[in-house]
Interface confidence: low
């Protein structure tokens, strides 16, 4: 799903207040709900009729450092006999997410939000067929 | 997929540098790759064999203010005849994502990262069957 543009209003102070100096703002350390965890069914990437593989990307100057991307294994979907049926399509499900990028020069460290497109998994869909009349 | 704990190291300065004052850090305004967009197939939530609905939650003190959650429509999956097949399961695909929480008292505005669990869509899986021994 889409993350709307910031429009530079969310991070601004109310109009009656002095502006934020130097184009930066104060970010409190610590993460709200840090212990919250995904509780997905196990091995759904293998058990799905539109199975997928995972690739892990690692960047020490990004939080989270590990970002996992899914890739659909097949064009079609897996039928009850375990065979690929290309009358159906395995398609990726994507999500826009935020990460934090760390930038440092010596002892001067600053952070910036970054939007990342993550493929979370795959789903099996019926292709839309349009015939020219 | 899981976002690991911060461990309070990512947001710290190198050990040889003076500590960050007041438990906060500098976050630059603006978002890297802000124009990046999801390019998912159209209407996959309706065309999927494990279809889902979307619910939008809105919070003006969160960025992004709009967070969209998916809910699987069925317990089973939709077969070629358009009927629900409960020998298969529709299961949610979840993703941990970061949002920014805005906190303000008068002209003092600060921000904090928050972890949110988002259900992005659903996929059709073969159920894990446990036999009683």
């Amino acid at each position: 799903r889409k993350i709307p543009k910031v429009g530079h209003t969310f991070f601004q102070k109310p109009e009656s207040c002095p502006p934020v100096p130097g184009g930066s703002m104060k970010l409190d350390i610590g993460i709200i709900n840090e212990n919250q965890r995904v509780s997905m069914s196990r091995n759904i990437e293998s058990r799905s009729t539109s199975p997928w593989n995972y690739t892990v990307t690692w960047d020490p100057n990004r939080y989270p450092s590990e970002v996992v991307q899914a890739q659909c294994r097949n064009l079609g979907c897996i039928n009850a006999q375990g065979k690929e049926d290309i009358s159906m399509n395995s398609v990726p499900i994507q999500q826009e997410t935020l990460v934090v990028r760390r930038k440092h020069q010596g002892c001067s460290v600053s952070f910036q939000l970054e939007k990342v497109l993550v493929t979370v998994g795959c789903t099996c869909v019926t292709p839309v067929i349009h015939h020219v009349q | 997929r899981k976002i690991p704990k911060v461990g309070h190291t990512f947001f710290q300065k190198p050990e040889s540098c003076p500590p960050v004052p007041g438990g906060s850090m500098k976050l630059d305004i603006g978002i890297i790759n802000e124009n990046q967009r999801v390019s998912m197939s159209r209407n996959i939530e309706s065309r999927s064999t494990s279809p889902w609905n979307y619910t939008v939650t809105w919070d003006p003190n969160r960025y992004p203010s709009e967070v969209v959650q998916a809910q699987c429509r069925n317990l089973g999956c939709i077969n070629a005849q358009g009927k629900e097949d409960i020998s298969m399961n529709s299961v949610p695909i979840q993703q941990e994502t970061l949002v920014v929480r805005r906190k303000h008292q008068g002209c003092s505005v600060s921000f904090q990262l928050e972890k949110v669990l988002v259900t992005v869509g659903c996929t059709c899986v073969t159920p894990v069957i446990h036999h009683v021994q």
Epitope: N89, P127, I129, H131 | -
Partner: antibody
């Protein structure tokens, strides 16, 4: 009516480049994958390249991989084929064609229901 | 990759006769994704059949497609003068077209 109008063919020396264009009208261009198919003189049809509706997936025949680039501009309802390092064996009549099915990320074809008029590419010194 | 082989290379028949064209795949092909085209000299190909057996819009009912797995057939029940042309089968994939069958007037 539904149509594809091609331009950009001609005579070119081996090793040089050429760009083919295909202008679509009469259908929702950005719903469909599009293809380039060629036919050497007196020979059969050969699929050259295909591109999904959102340019997310692109496919090429082995014979043109690394030399040809397919692209599309949905805002202009146009399909392109950039041909570099041309060889004598690329001499052919080139057709653009519309995919029959709306598919999700395909660059291969299930069937092509609308074809351009064809444009001739001759590679010769 | 799957290779499509069409036979015969040339079919010599008279108007009014029945034409049977064969397309054989080197491996099983989903019948959902086999198509047939007609091409006349100096013209672009024209889609006749998709999904192995469905007629494209505007195609006369004397044209029919059948088959599954590795063997597919295009049948023209009664040849009309305008049917003399080259016919190609096509499958989903990176090398999709067969070599063609020419139907000529005997």
């Amino acid at each position: 009516q539904v149509q594809l109008v091609q331009s950009g063919g001609g005579l070119v020396q081996p090793g040089r480049s050429l760009r083919l264009s295909c202008a679509a009208s009469g259908f929702t261009f950005d719903d469909y994958a599009m293809h380039w198919v060629r036919q050497a003189p007196g020979k059969g049809l050969e699929w050259v390249s295909g591109i999904s509706w959102n340019s997310g997936t692109i496919g090429y025949a082995d014979s043109v991989k690394g030399r040809f680039t397919i692209s599309r501009d949905n805002a202009k309802n146009s399909l392109y084929l950039q041909m570099n390092s041309l060889r004598a064996e690329d001499t052919a009549l080139y057709y653009c064609a519309k995919e029959l099915y709306i598919s999700d990320w395909d660059s291969y074809s299930y069937g092509m229901d609308v074809w351009g008029q064809g444009t001739t590419v001759t590679v010769s010194s | 990759e799957i290779v499509l082989t069409q036979s015969p290379g040339t079919l010599s028949l008279s108007p009014g006769e029945r034409a049977t064209l064969s397309c054989r795949a080197s491996q099983s092909v989903s019948s959902s994704y086999l198509a047939w085209y007609q091409q006349k000299p100096g013209q672009a190909p024209r889609l006749l059949i998709y999904g192995a057996s469905s007629r494209a819009t505007g195609i006369p009912d004397r044209f029919s497609g059948s088959g599954s797995g590795t063997d597919f057939t295009l049948t023209i029940s009664r040849l009309e003068p305008e049917d003399f042309a080259v016919y190609y089968c096509q499958q989903y994939g990176s090398s999709p077209f067969g070599g063609g069958t020419k139907v000529e007037i005997k």
